[in-house]
């Protein structure tokens, strides 16, 4: 069943059909004898009660006051009296834009990330019965879909896809054809999500080391959950037994971005490890960003800057 | 629109230089790095390197180090790419495409290295 | 380098058939930290550059018609056009965007038989 108008300002366009349905139906059906009225308040005007004799265009059903259609001079307040429960709206009825198939002022806007998942289903539950068919416009081109009841869109959103999209619904009542039509400005930003990935610390670390230890190399870095952290290093990586990448540690944080930890572990320290690069790279659609580690011998650390040196 | 838009062909002798342009628009460019790909005629798809627009690090394949080189000018969403020494060899259509996984295309720039 | 290799280098196909073109790497392109695999599928007409069909493996990108699908993980892909078409004749590369270099198959050219 259609939700009741709770929103206490309405605006709504002239020529269109439109309902108000108060929020006691259930109610009401269960005290049929309570006297159930509607009444309507503009300006000075004192409430005057509506039923069908005050206006071909008004219709009354259990819960609800139809206009078919509603016009600007049905502006005002609007009363629903039943016992000693009442519910009012304000009702603003605007000018209809002749010169588009939409009214700006009745858009509901949406933003949708780019290549996230986008939709525009064409309902209407409240008048679906009466609805004989249902188009979908793009900036008030017609869009060729198959379905002419309830069209729709389902797609991950390009930029091209940013649009006034509007869902118009014909139908009939006494004899008479009306539309009704819902109109969404959609616009695609860019992924908010991502951030670009950076790596913790010094972008150059010299590491003292003795011969024949072991050391431990750790690479951290903040990064979106598809990046990638790796080790790079010698001609070709696997060459060298004493050397091995630890599994990468991942902790998301709270504002859902990935703290992550790589550590290479050198083993039994030679010559060969010595005075060269050892690269952590983190790789992103964005492109890759690059630290480099280099192994010096303890007793050569006199040589350079202490600010260089990581432990 | 979204679209990258590449400088035109070139005609260079051996052992010239060329430079080709691909302007970014309708993106922010710093979000996404900049590959190069060329394919030679009637040939696949080579990768040769790319650049990441936010910090301006480079990855070269190890076939083109030390004669290309890419830059980008963020003040016009253009990226670069520099070929030098050019040889017979590297006649082909170059192309500038975007991310990781090449989601937008530049139509490509023909280059041919004849004398 | 990872070396993308695709099979069959050509391949003929009735128009409305299934047309399957399979990709091995020489190591897995497959992330153990996101469970992500980092491969993607082209498709590239004469004269035009290459459009990209599928990225994550599976992926469809937006606006390629569902008769397209990538499936495999860790070192071997496939990409299945369920019911060819005439306007999908074309060359098909896949590509590994896991390290730098990133490679390209040698590609696979789709004829209509």
């Known amino acids: 069943a259609e939700s009741c108008t709770s929103r206490p300002h309405i605006t709504v366009v002239e020529g269109e059909p439109f309902y108000l349905k108060h929020c006691s139906c259930s109610l009401a059906h269960e005290i049929e004898t309570t006297t159930k009225s509607w009444y309507k308040s503009s300006g000075s005007q004192e409430h005057v009660e509506l039923n069908p004799r005050s206006s071909s265009r008004i219709a009354l059903h259990d819960c609800v006051l139809e206009f078919w259609p509603v016009e600007l001079n049905d502006t005002g307040s609007y009363f629903f009296q039943m016992k000693n429960y009442t519910q009012k709206w304000k009702l603003n009825v605007i000018r209809r834009n002749k010169h588009s198939c939409f009214t700006e002022r009745q858009v509901t806007s949406k933003i949708v990330e780019v290549k996230k998942f986008f939709q525009i289903t064409c309902e209407n539950s409240y008048y679906q019965t009466l609805v004989n068919s249902t188009s979908l416009y793009k900036n008030c081109k017609k869009l060729l879909l198959e379905n002419n009841k309830n069209p729709t869109i389902k797609k991950n959103a390009e930029f091209e896809d940013q649009g006034y999209y509007s869902c118009v619904h014909f139908l009939h009542h006494n004899g008479k054809l009306f539309n009704i039509t819902k109109t969404f400005n959609i616009t695609i930003v860019e992924d908010r999500s991502n951030i670009v990935p950076v790596l913790l610390g010094p972008k150059l670390n010299h590491v003292a080391v003795e011969l024949g230890k072991n050391v431990r190399l750790n690479c951290s870095a903040l990064l979106n959950e598809e990046d990638v952290i790796y080790w790079m290093f010698g001609e070709e990586n696997g060459s060298d037994p004493n050397i091995h990448e630890e599994k990468e540690m991942r902790i998301m944080t709270p504002e859902g971005k990935w703290h992550a930890s790589k550590v290479l572990r050198i083993e039994n320290i030679g010559e060969s490890n010595l005075n060269v690069l050892y690269n952590c790279t983190v790789a992103s659609t964005g492109g890759t960003d690059t630290k480099s580690f280099i192994l010096v011998r303890k007793a050569d650390m006199a040589d350079i800057p202490g600010h260089v040196f990581t432990r | 629109q979204v679209q990258l838009v590449q400088s035109g062909a070139e005609v260079k002798k051996p052992g010239a230089s060329v430079k080709v342009s691909c302007k970014a628009s309708?993106?922010?460019?710093?979000?996404?790095?900049i590959s190069w790909v060329r394919q030679a005629p009637g040939q696949g798809l080579e990768w040769m390197g790319w650049i990441s627009v936010y910090n301006g690090n480079t990855n070269y394949a190890q076939k083109h180090q030390g004669r290309v080189t890419m830059t980008t000018d963020t003040s016009t969403s253009t990226a670069y790419m520099e070929l030098r020494s050019l040889r017979s060899d590297d006649t082909a259509v170059y192309y500038c495409?975007?991310?990781?996984?090449?989601?937008?295309w530049g139509r490509g720039t023909l280059v041919t290295v004849s004398s | 380098d990872i070396v993308m290799t695709q099979s069959p280098d050509s391949l003929a196909v009735s128009l409305g058939e299934r047309a399957t073109i399979n990709c091995k790497s020489s190591q897995t392109v497959l992330y153990s930290s996101n469970n992500k695999t980092y491969l993607a599928w082209y498709q590239q007409k004469p004269g035009q550059p290459p459009k990209l069909l599928i990225y994550w493996a599976s992926t469809r990108e937006s606006g390629v018609p569902d008769r397209f699908s990538g499936s495999g993980s860790g070192t071997d892909f496939t990409l299945t056009i369920s019911s060819l078409q005439a306007e999908d004749v074309a060359v098909y590369y896949c590509?590994?965007?896991?390290?730098?270099?990133?490679?390209f198959g040698q590609g696979t050219k789709l004829e209509i038989k």
């Open positions: 495409a975007r991310g990781w996984y090449f989601d937008l």
């Open positions: 309708g993106y922010t460019f710093t979000s996404y790095g």
């Open positions: 590509q590994q965007y896991y390290r730098t270099p990133y490679t």
